[in-house]
């Protein structure tokens, strides 16, 4: 015969958070440490697990095929029951009834996914949406690996993904003073650097790199590499490439200058020699296989070159250089110095010796030059 | 272990063709490019073709370009070299290679096939 | 294609000896040049991969080093299984281009 249970039988309600896919152990104790009668109920009263004799009995729920007790500990007077592979919809009050008293837990199952693909061109956006059961009013708090915090309800959105936005997030839901953490992996899909220059002296050998700011196991696509050279009035395309499985393969090159470009990652491309015809900036484009967009890196060549004509000495530099950067011409051991903020400096009649031609920014020397000048006789006049 | 093993080589007459195979045991083929390399009598080291794993790139040095063709079929472990319209200054022995994982270097060679050019 | 040059062609050397092979590259190849030993009637052997990688089983006295696009190898005391000829490899781009080789003899 049934007893009837009173409503002082009755425990205050937990709450309990759960995440979609993950197991939830709702714990139920008898106050005596032993094997006694339990059932597991839903709100609709039909029956999930209970104990009959010394087995454990599943009733027609849906979760009789995902709720299990952990056995081993029924003799100690514990009658949990686990849930896996947790579903939204699981999302109920679940009572639990053992020595006449019922304990009611609430248990809410959260679910939070990226409405897109978790690897994102950088610039792109992200939304994360929440999956929560009705009548629930969660809020939910994200952390970027970088420290950024944002905050939403049913979703969350960055505008645009910046490289330092790669990594693990950490998103807190809260629910009822009761939270539950979700780990999401996003890969901003970017160059290390959005920019770079190269100085070099006239001649010297030039090698432009191009590292990923990311590592997928196969990586396809293709790209290409404009150049605006700063004596040209347009643009030109230097390379195309593909990149099947991270082995690079050149399609097309120009014939001036003569590039060469590495097969392996990451990218990588050398000119034989600085010229001042090449100086200026280019663009490196990436197109990745199924995504749309393209992965950009602006490269700038600076080129120096100091020369002696008669009794002219110039030091001159092309390509992209900030008005802020110093150019000097300075006799080596010598205080003789002369300094502009321009692209060309020169000396008259200089004094024989090293001559040092230096490109500086705030002190620092981006590239220098030599250049010796040797003493110039007075030609004799003929009888 | 890795094991590389060619066949094919031999005697033939100026502009006749031949066809070399290079036989892999011991490893999943599609992953490694390989890559065929010669040495004339008493000379140095030459680089002659290379492949992708996947199999879709195919490289070729100035010297062989149009004449040789590179192929592999991964379902056999074997790497094929069609030798035609062949020179006096083919003869060699013929090595085929294989690259290490991510193309670090070429760290499994064969013993080499004898190709003979002459009339 | 990217030319290899290697000096010198010939070394005449004694046990316990060090000596140098150096390897100039045309064009920047990053690090992307091997060491091949080949001796007589065999196939080649690397040696070093990636202008310093010791590969496994080769003995210590074998290193390499880049200074822009010269590359060395040294073995700093010669023993008499190194008699042979040593090749470099730049395999940075397609196609790959082997130095000329250097005949290391027995003085």
């Known amino acids: 015969e049934q007893k009837l249970i009173s409503e002082e039988d009755l425990a205050a309600k937990k709450v309990v958070l759960g995440k979609k896919g993950d197991t939830v152990e709702l714990t139920c104790n008898a106050s005596q440490k032993k094997n006694t009668q339990f059932h597991w109920k839903n709100s609709n009263q039909i029956k999930i697990l209970g104990i009959q004799g010394l087995f454990l009995t599943k009733g027609p729920s849906k979760l009789s095929d995902r709720a299990d007790s952990r056995k081993s500990l029924w003799d100690q007077g514990c009658f949990s029951m686990i849930i896996k592979n947790l579903k939204i919809e699981d999302s109920d009050t679940y009572i639990c009834e053992v020595e006449n008293k019922k304990e009611e837990v609430e248990l809410l199952v959260f679910g939070l996914t990226a409405n897109s693909d978790t690897h994102l061109l950088e610039g792109q956006s992200l939304t994360l949406t929440l999956e929560s059961p009705p009548g629930s009013s969660p809020s939910v708090k994200c952390r970027s690996p970088g420290g950024k915090n944002i905050q939403g309800g049913r979703t969350i959105s960055v505008p645009q993904l910046e490289r330092q936005d790669s990594g693990t997030w950490t998103c807190t839901v809260s629910q009822d003073q009761k939270t539950v953490e979700f780990k999401i992996d996003i890969v901003v899909l970017a160059f290390q650097k959005a920019s770079s220059t190269v100085y070099k002296k006239e001649g010297e050998q030039v090698e432009f790199s191009f590292p990923l700011a990311f590592t997928l196991e196969k990586l396809t696509g293709s790209g290409e590499l404009w150049w605006q050279a700063e004596r040209a009035s347009s643009s030109k395309s230097w390379i195309t490439f593909d990149l099947k499985n991270k082995e690079v393969s050149v399609k097309r090159v120009t014939q001036d200058p003569k590039l060469q470009m590495g097969k392996k990652l990451p990218l990588h491309l050398t000119l034989p020699q600085a010229l001042p015809q090449y100086a200026g900036s280019g663009n490196l484009t990436l197109a990745l296989e199924a995504k749309t967009g393209k992965l950009h890196q602006e490269v700038n060549l600076v080129v120096m070159r100091a020369t002696q004509f008669q009794e002219n000495l110039t030091c001159e530099v092309w390509g992209p250089t900030s008005p802020k950067l110093t150019l000097s011409l300075k006799l080596e051991n010598k205080g003789a110095t002369v300094s502009k903020q321009a692209k060309a400096v020169w000396v008259l009649n200089p004094e024989a010796g090293m001559w040092q031609c230096l490109l500086s920014d705030s002190g620092q020397v981006l590239l220098e030059s030599n250049i010796k000048v040797v003493p110039t006789w007075p030609t004799p006049v003929q009888p | 272990e890795v094991e590389l093993l060619e066949s094919g080589g031999g005697l033939v007459q100026p502009g006749g063709s031949l066809r070399l195979s290079c036989a892999a045991s011991g490893l999943t083929f599609s992953t490694f490019a390989m890559s065929w390399v010669r040495q004339a009598p008493g000379k140095g080291l030459e680089w002659v073709s290379g492949?992708?794993?996947?199999?879709?790139?195919?490289y070729y040095a100035d010297s062989v370009k149009g004449r040789f063709t590179i192929t592999s079929d991964n379902s056999k472990n074997t790497l094929y070299l069609q030798m035609n319209s062949l020179r006096a200054e083919d003869t060699a022995v013929y090595y085929c290679?294989?690259?290490?994982?991510?193309?670090?270097?070429?760290?499994?060679w064969g013993k080499g096939t004898t190709v003979t050019v002459s009339s | 294609a990217i030319q290899m040059t290697q000096s010198p062609s010939s070394l005449s050397a004694s046990v316990g000896d060090r000596v140098t092979i150096t390897c100039r590259a045309s064009?920047?190849?990053?690090?992307?040049l091997g060491w091949y030993q080949q001796k007589p009637g065999k196939a080649p052997k690397v040696l070093i991969s990636e202008t310093s990688s010791l590969q496994s089983g080769v003995p210590s006295r074998f290193s390499g080093s880049r200074s822009g696009t010269d590359f060395t190898l040294t073995i700093s005391s010669l023993q008499p299984e190194d008699f042979a000829t040593y090749y470099c490899l730049q395999d940075y781009t397609y196609p790959y281009t082997f130095g000329q080789g250097t005949k290391l003899e027995i003085k």
């Open positions: 290679a294989k690259e290490g994982y991510n193309w670090n270097y070429m760290d499994v």
């Open positions: 492949i992708s794993g996947s199999g879709e790139n195919t």
């Open positions: 064009h920047g190849i990053r690090n992307d």
